[in-house]
Amino acid sequence: APTSSSTKKTQLQLEHLLLDLQMILNGINNYKNPKLTRMLTFKFYMPKKATELRHLQCLEEELKPLEEVLNLAQSKSFHLRDTKDLISNINVIVLELKGSETTLMCEYADETATIVEFLNRWITFCQSIISTLT
């Protein structure tokens, strides 16, 4: 059974992940971003089911495409925090949260999504898990 300290750690990690995903979403999905039309042509694969921490495997598998899109966003008039560091931080959190004991084969939904839908989905996931922990 998880201890209160491990639950607290999980909650903090989820909150960090949530903040990073929200920061990306707010950064790209605004009218100051001149590359938005291009970024929204990228397809992202959505999890068929995302209710447990182990389902973060599906997010991990999409981090490389996410990095590619964020690299595209960088321009003189628009700047996100260093993309490589940001994705690396997310990756570290995801690996810790999902655990490495069981390797899950991610099951994806049939329909793909824009980066905005993708980020919203994982933000909702984080919020949902946090609410069950508190």
Partner: antibody, heavy 124, light 108 residues
Amino acid sequence: QVQLQESGPGLVKPSQTLSLTCTVSGGSISSGGYYWSWIRQHPGKGLEWIGYIYYSGSTDYNPSLKSRGIISGDTSKNQFSLKLNSVTAADTAVYYCAREGRFGELGSYYFDYWGQGTLVTVSS
Amino acid sequence: SYELTQPPSVSVSPGQTARIACSGDALPRKFAYWYQQKSGQAPVLVISEDSRRPSGIPERFSGSSSGTMATLTISGAQVEDEADYYCFSTDSSANHRVFGGGTKLTVL
């Protein structure tokens, strides 16, 4: 209802500059979130994206034009323009101006409003 | 430069299903959009993001994508569907925004 109207000379001599203007009514080119594009169609052929200007003034072009194109906006007249330098017969086409709008907050962009197109012939 | 490849023409009888393919190396990770252009008119979007149908577009229009191929399907094609159809997408880095060569659909 947004309407776009292209205007400019129908005949341009080789090596000269093609200049076209798109006048927008029913919407402002300075309102956030829209891209204002030029697209052309060679006679009996397919469509080719030329470039766009964003409401903020940022521009983007088709790399195949090799820096011959310049798109600019005039918010006071609610117009945006295309200048294409060093034209050849290969630039003979119907030129469309179009707006790229977005499907809500989650969706992507698409060309939602178009002008009726203007034929430009490059010939001496 | 990046290319999207379409068949030049497709013919069907009224009521039959018409399928128009569009192939491009980046399509596994890039959305395809489909525009219909009737003679002498500006293009109109019929499918967005591989398979989403804008409001006002008849249900007989649908889209799908698998691997490097996107497909526009018109189930029970009608005479008024006769037009040129163009797929539109971007290359893998989204630097090249490209229309396919177009497919002339004839509904005989």
